[in-house]
Amino acid sequence: VPGEAEQPAPELVEVEVGSTALLKCGLSQSQGNLSHVDWFSVHKEKRTLIFRVRQGQGQSEPGEYEQRLSLQDRGATLALTQVTPQDERIFLCQGKRPRSQEYRIQLRVYKAPEEPNIQVNPLGIPVNSKEPEEVATCVGRNGYPIPQVIWYKNGRPLKEEKNRVHIQSSQTVESSGLYTLQSILKAQLVKEDKDAQFYCELNYRLPSGNHMKESREVTVPVFYPTEKVWLEVEPVGMLKEGDRVEIRCLADGNPPPHFSISKQNPSTREAEEETTNDNGVLVLEPARKEHSGRYECQGLDLDTMISLLSEPQELLVNYVSDVRVSPAAPERQEGSSLTLTCEAESSQDLEFQWLREETGQVLERGPVLQLHDLKREAGGGYRCVASVPSIPGLNRTQLVNVAIFGPPWMAFKERKVWVKENMVLNLSCEASGHPRPTISWNVNGTASEQDQDPQRVLSTLNVLVTPELLETGVECTASNDLGKNTSILFLELVNLTTLTPDSNTTTGLSTSTASPHTRANSTSTERKLPEPESRG
């Protein structure tokens, strides 16, 4: 073509794959009549006629563009739909009159790659490899043109470095004409890279400008030999009997060595291997004082048969022994004195307290409790508590029963019980004394006796309410070697219909719905009579 060397650079048209390219013929009116134009595609310097414009009417030529071309803008623009990467070429329009002139358009096609897919080397990398090993592979699919890849470690771009970092990239052309890029990062890693975050970035261009896509961040398994093994005990701090204690072996290598935990036998001084669970953890549950001692961990690297030993660790399971009280079963006369002494052993300093069992009242802080001028009321339970103040929850207790010699002592002297004729009444009578008394009743019925504690007894009597019984009342008599004592229960008839909900706050009422000869639950809300009574 004459004068081709002086031709200006083609006009650049940029378009994304799949969209429509508008190829505007830039011939001026003086250069040619746009109603008479031929359009060509140029590929490898070969021109192919693809479209004719005659009298403003367009006609596609048979071939690859036949279905995708149309005229727009009153014939000045050729529209190419469904652009593909193969369309990246020069298109030219040639005016036929008054003389042959042409206008060239360079079509550039773009397609953003898919999100980069990163795959870490699942086998991991040993730190002492002689040359760079594969860290990860990055794949960017279906981009056009070929995107650029940049690898990052901990947010910093990685550069090629002889014998240290090597980036190996390759690409394949899909049938669609799009490129798939694969980039392999090879590097020599060090132990500190075990937590390093790697990712790849794809840089690509679109008609709108430069863009980039980042992969997710990955860490690569880094293998390095163990230099140190050590023991860790949970919970941290002071341990006590009953705790769940876990002793585990740890190592600074990856993979960790094969662990075993041993405890020194105090008599032979040999390290005896302990049985660990599937995770290699020695669980002491519940921990006992016998678990105290010197533990150590051995790590065996099965790849080299090198064995590593931890520093020994002393484990102390704090304890309080059984508490002993002397005298163990004290008996005293009224008016006398008593000294109770509490003893226990512990791995730590102990604190002692004496409490009254019935009330929980603290009587003494210390191992010795002195009781003077003993009264009958002083009989009963006393509890010694031995505790380690520095370890909450570490304590043991012992209960001692103090017996005061004396004749039976009744829980009540007299009591009024509301009853209905023909009901089966359940009466109870309680007495204490030392020696422990026995109880008898003055009426026939089914009686049962129950020891409440070493000095106290409770007797219950089931009896049918008869007119005679209403007249005589019921007596219970408690007796022991030192004497006897009696309680009287007065029986009074009640008309159940006259009862109000709170009438049982009067004097010991039995609110049983009773029919003749049926048992009524008459463990009456028995209350003492209003007048003062002697408890002798």
């Epitope: 040993p126 002492n128 490899s129 293998f223 030999p225 075993s260 041993s262 001084r269 040999e270 390290a271 005896e272 291997e273 051995q298 690297d301 790849d303 080299t304 048969m305 090198i306 064995s307 590593l308 030993l309």
Partner: antibody, heavy 120, light 112 residues
Framework: DVKLVESGGDLVKPGGSLKLSCAAS????????MSWVRQTPEKRLEWVAT????????YYPDSVKGRFTISRDNAKNTLYLQMSSLKSEDTAMYYC?????????????WGQGTLVTVSA | DIVMSQSPSSLAVSAGEKVTMNCKSS????????????LAWYQQKPGQSPKLLIY???TRESGVPDRFTGSGSGTDFTLTISSVQAEDLAVYYC????????FGAGTKLELK
């Protein structure tokens, strides 16, 4: 027959570097744990380094850690010991050794040794 | 670190004599689970490389004459040669592998 031949021993100045090699034959080199052991002029034996059969795991005593590097090339049936920051106390006969198939660390086979002298 | 102490440092014997040498470790070398001690004995004849004699404290390496016997457990070990031959004149080293690897200083066996 198992054969281990060390080479590379030399006279070197303190602070210098040296690389020892051990050519192995008569067994499947890539299947065995290999080690270096040295013997001082006072005839004391000292373990120097151990490497796993695949080369991924290495161990050293504190006396050489960070200065010596054991490596292997299973394709060439060769064991190496790269020594740097050498000290006069590194002067010794260096032996290449092979473990055996026991579940314990033993040096079952020894080479004839190569002499390393560190002196100003 | 585990320290290995050998005694005596040298020993002069006549051919045919029974000889014992000792090796003491600063801690027990017994693995209680497998009931084995991580201790080996090596022999080094003049001008030669060391040679493995015994491992697991008492297991003879194949090819080692049965006049060599290893015994002991925990921290105290003994190598006994029931009837010394001229070819037994050498330095004998014990080595522990319970925690890394350390050798004893050796016991030198000489002829009277």
């Amino acid at each position: 027959d198992v054969k281990l031949v060390e080479s590379g021993g030399d006279l070197v100045k303190p602070g210098g570097s040296l690389k020892l090699s051990c050519a192995a034959s008569g067994f499947t080199f890539s299947s065995y744990i290999m080690s270096w052991v040295r013997q001082t002029p006072e005839k004391r034996l000292e373990w120097v380094a151990t490497i796993s059969s695949g080369g991924s795991s290495t161990y050293y005593p504190d006396s050489v850690k960070g200065r010596f590097t054991i490596s292997r090339d299973n394709a060439k049936n060769t064991l190496y010991l790269q020594m740097s920051s050498l000290k006069s106390e590194d002067t010794a006969m260096y032996y290449c050794t092979r473990d055996d198939d026991y579940d314990v660390k033993v040096f079952a086979y020894w080479g004839q040794g190569t002499l390393v002298t560190v002196s100003a | 670190d585990i320290v290995m102490s050998q005694s005596p440092s040298s020993l002069a014997v006549s051919a045919g004599e029974k000889v014992t040498m000792n090796c003491k470790s600063s801690r027990s070398l017994l693995n209680s689970r497998i009931r084995k001690n991580y201790l080996a004995w090596y022999q080094q004849k003049p001008g030669q490389s060391p040679k493995l004699l015994i491992y697991w404290a008492s297991t003879r390496e194949s090819g080692v004459p049965d006049r060599f016997t290893g015994s002991g457990s925990g921290t105290d070990f003994t190598l006994t040669i029931s009837s010394v031959q001229a070819e037994d004149l050498a330095v004998y080293y014990c080595k522990q592998s319970y925690n890394l690897l350390t050798f004893g200083a050796g016991t030198k066996l000489e002829l009277k």
